[in-house]
Amino acid sequence: LVVTPPGPELVLNVSSTFVLTCSGSAPVVWERMSQEPPQEMAKAQDGTFSSVLTLTNLTGLDTGEYFCTHNDSRGLETDERKRLYIFVPDPTVGFLPNDAEELFIFLTEITEITIPCRVTDPQLVVTLHEKKGDVALPVPYDHQRGFSGIFEDRSYICKTTIGDREVDSDAYYVYRLQVSSINVSVNAVQTVVRQGENITLMCIVIGNEVVNFEWTYPRKESGRLVEPVTDFLLDMPYHIRSILHIPSAELEDSGTYTCNVTESVNDHQDEKAINITVVESGYVRLLGEVGTLQFAELHRSRTLQVVFEAYPPPTVLWFKDNRTLGDSSAGEIALSTRNVSETRYVSELTLVRVKVAEAGHYTMRAFHEDAEVQLSFQLQINVPVRVLELSESHPDSGEQTVRCRGRGMPQPNIIWSACRDLKRCPRELPPTLLGNSSEEESQLETNVTYWEEEQEFEVVSTLRLQHVDRPLSVRCTLRNAVGQDTQEVIVVPHSLPFK
């Protein structure tokens, strides 16, 4: 199967139209949420089958999985299918809606489950909370699936911030039916260690007096046995703990560690596993990409976020134009680095009510004794345009000139327009655009200057009107990525008395 574009993840604009194509040696079909959306199927002269799925007027609700599969009545011996995940960032959609059965999660054992709260924008930071608590839980999040981990019998909600509003998901309820009289949990002091460091795992059983522990681990397979230590946690009834301690770990100690617990009275047993990774040396790795040019709007707050993985915990520094940044006492800059899982970190630089002077070259550096990584970007401060001056003059040449001056960042575009019928303009008659025709009626001259200190562009445009035979409303509109501004002036013919 060949899918175009290949994905596996696409981020598409809201309200746009997008075409997905899948082709194969047998009939193919696109599937979305276990259904086949309307699509165009065809067979080429060379015997290739294809299906084209056109997604129109995209909204956040189009976020999700799309599959292309063989749709062959001959029953081809294949379960090949291609998965594509599409994000349509849509600020009007908070969390994607769930079916009722996704809100209630039923279990008979302690096992990893997923709380499927998903957002439309892969850049959003999503946190998980107990419904009754405010503290974010340290559970890994996958934007395509949700939060995966081992959850207690509680109710949970997800939170994110879209723009400046906090959005909560529906509540998810975890129901666990205790069918086994043995309840085993395994945890490690660390699941990632460097060679030479220690591995320590604990296996705890609740509610049983007489149990037998058996550990399986990579060293055991090579005949190198480690003697576990078993103890009773006296402050809790029937909490029995087995500790497996491996000093000075080697790379070969990476793998699955399983604790199997048996209870002979009722012949119950349970086992839990955990993965341990031994790395040669520490690491720091960036996750995702941050564009080399970032934008912030003047007087608005802006948070710049970098996500990375590291072990051991790194030191994180932020620099602007090679000078170290720190939390400012005036509250203009806030720096934070959060540990969102054992080895994953989110570092944020928040600029509060951005000022022009905060434009520049920013670098985040994360490092420890084994490795370092740095990420740099240029921050451009966008300034909404404003028209500073619109004036009209009558030079001796007989023509009349109108001069418009304005500023903004990025560089403003200038649009001149005029209205000849003052009574009906602009409500009934649309204004006529000026200066972009080859007619001799008007001529346009525009100069652009970049002011280094203010970090913005100034546009000065002069419109020359050859003959004005009746009063004319002339409008100068400046536009850039973050706004527009307009001013108007009435130009009267030479022959009329001064207005």
Epitope: F106, E130, D153, R154, Y175
Partner: nanobody, 116 residues
């Protein structure tokens, strides 16, 4: 303390219906649903549907839509789940369960056997 007590085991013929009851005591979760879940031997728990305490709101899993009805007798705080047109693969233990926010509560289960 919340307690959910379910009716006893049932043996039914294919095509018949079964009505399982779940009596709740200490149940004060006026905004909490009563869930119905089943476990076919050797398989995972499967959600059947839910009803609210006043019995005026129900949601059924698509798989059981049209074949299940959930009702409530508010006077006796008893919840009912009735499954129609039984098939042999409906043989399972049926549980009622509710959630208090910080933990869940389960009935002891009702074994329904469908056999000709």
């Amino acid at each position: 303390q919340v307690q959910l007590v379910q009716s006893g085991a049932e043996v039914k013929k294919p095509g018949a219906s079964v009505k399982v009851s779940c009596r709740a005591s200490g149940y004060t979760f006026t905004n909490s649903f009563m869930q119905w879940v089943r476990q076919v031997p050797g398989q995972r728990l499967e959600w059947v549907g839910l009803s609210n305490p006043s019995g005026d709101y129900t949601v059924y899993a698509p798989k059981f839509q049209g074949r299940v009805t959930m009702t409530t007798d508010t006077a006796t705080s008893t919840f009912y789940m009735e499954l129609f047109s039984l098939r042999s693969d409906d043989t399972a233990v049926y549980y009622c369960a509710t959630h208090g926010g910080d933990r869940s509560y389960w009935g002891q289960g009702t074994l329904v056997t469908v056999s000709s």
